[in-house]
């Protein structure tokens, strides 16, 4: 769930998610609408799609707690949990490394971005 995601993002990016990413742009944080503002925002939009897919599969994305290992900069999702737990971990791992890959284009002005300014077509999944 959310606790897993926060911890994973902090470990991978080195940034405190609550200060740096939740919210950020038009898709990082709860909800999301409009065209993503930059590559970091695209990471979150893709992550939203990943979660949406798991919701259609009956997974409790905010409640399910999974185990994972973080060592030498890599995330290893445990194969011990249920299908939902493993897939949820995979979604979170993907967004964490996506955010890390795009740290160089991170824009402080997009933190706490005013959502009514999020216009344009919301990308489909």
């Amino acid at each position: 769930g959310i606790l897993n995601l926060n911890k994973m993002v902090k470990q991978v990016t080195g940034k405190m998610p609550i200060l740096s990413y939740w919210p950020y742009g038009c898709h990082c944080g709860l909800g999301g609408r409009g065209q993503p503002k930059d590559a970091t925002d695209w990471c979150c939009q893709t992550h939203d799609c990943c979660y949406d897919h798991l919701k259609t599969q009956g997974c409790s994305i905010y409640k399910d707690y999974y185990r994972y290992n973080f060592s030498q900069g890599n995330i290893h999702c445990s194969d011990k949990g249920s299908w939902c737990e493993q897939q949820l971990c995979a979604c979170d791992k993907e967004v964490a490394f996506c955010l890390k890959r795009n740290l160089d284009t991170y824009q402080k002005r997009l933190r706490f971005y005013w959502r009514p300014h999020c216009r344009g077509q919301t990308p489909g999944c």
Epitope: G58, S60, W83
Partner: antibody, heavy 120, light 106 residues
Framework: QVTLKESGPGILQSSQTLSLTCSFS??????????VAWIRRPSGKGLEWLAH???????RYNPSLKSRLTISKDTSRNQVFLKITSVDTADTATYYC????????????WGTGTTVTVSS | QIVLTQSPAIMSASPGEKVTISCSAS?????MYWYQQKPGSSPKPWIY???NLASGVPARFSGSGSGTSYSLTISSMEAEDAATYYC?????????FGAGTKLELK
């Protein structure tokens, strides 16, 4: 050849603690990905998963029974243990231990089972 | 938790007859697993990941399904197939089993 064998008290009184032992051979619980579970079948009912323990000592419990269950292992002696506190007649069942193969979501080898009767 | 409902609870089939045992999940699952249990014996893995036969399972058995509806089929019933069959999921925690279908020889 992989084998598992359960042992227990046979009969015990209501409110007592049930202690079960699973002795296994043919595999090691120190192998990455390996796990052993306890499953029971009350007389005339279906199977119920109770708990799991893994090579790294990670433990999982059935939420409906979690407060009463404790699973543990002795890797060097190839044994897994289950304790159920405050038993009552509803805990009368055949108890099985089973191996969960690495990376699978099912049990590939089961023990023969041990019958436990709780008397009031 | 996901509840697995097996139907029928008890059934009988004649040798050579086609048999279908159903397992319905209370919400969608990714895979279903099946076990066979005979009186006095422990359960044996029978079908894994919905449609794959476990080692030593005769080819007359098959598994299928998706979402909330899964089934185990015997193309031609034989005496040795008389047993109780259980379905199991671990799509989401906790891991759950169906109550079982007892298949008898007519």
């Amino acid at each position: 050849q992989v084998t598992l064998k359960e042992s227990g008290p046979g009969i015990l009184q209501s409110s007592q603690t049930l202690s079960l032992t699973c002795s296994f051979s043919g595999f090691s619980l120190s192998t990455s990905g390996m796990g052993v579970a306890w499953i029971r079948r009350p007389s005339g009912k279906g199977l119920e998963w109770l708990a799991h323990i893994y090579w790294d000592d990670d433990k999982r419990y059935n939420p409906s029974l979690k407060s009463r269950l404790t699973i543990s292992k002795d890797t060097s002696r190839n044994q897994v243990f289950l304790k159920i506190t405050s038993v009552d007649t509803a805990d009368t069942a055949t108890y099985y231990c089973a191996r969960r193969g690495p990376g699978t979501w099912y049990f590939d080898v089961w023990g023969t089972g041990t019958t436990v009767t709780v008397s009031s | 938790q996901i509840v697995l409902t097996q139907s029928p609870a008890i059934m009988s089939a004649s040798p050579g007859e086609k048999v279908t045992i159903s397992c319905s999940a209370s919400s969608s699952v990714s895979y279903m697993y099946w076990y066979q249990q005979k009186p006095g014996s422990s359960p044996k893995p029978w079908i894994y990941r919905t449609s794959n036969l476990a080692s030593g399972v005769p080819a007359r058995f098959s598994g299928s399904g998706s979402g909330t509806s899964y089934s185990l089929t015997i193309s031609s019933m034989e005496a040795e197939d008389a047993a109780t069959y259980y379905c199991q999921q671990y799509h989401s925690s906790p891991l759950t089993f169906g109550a079982g279908t007892k298949l008898e020889l007519k």
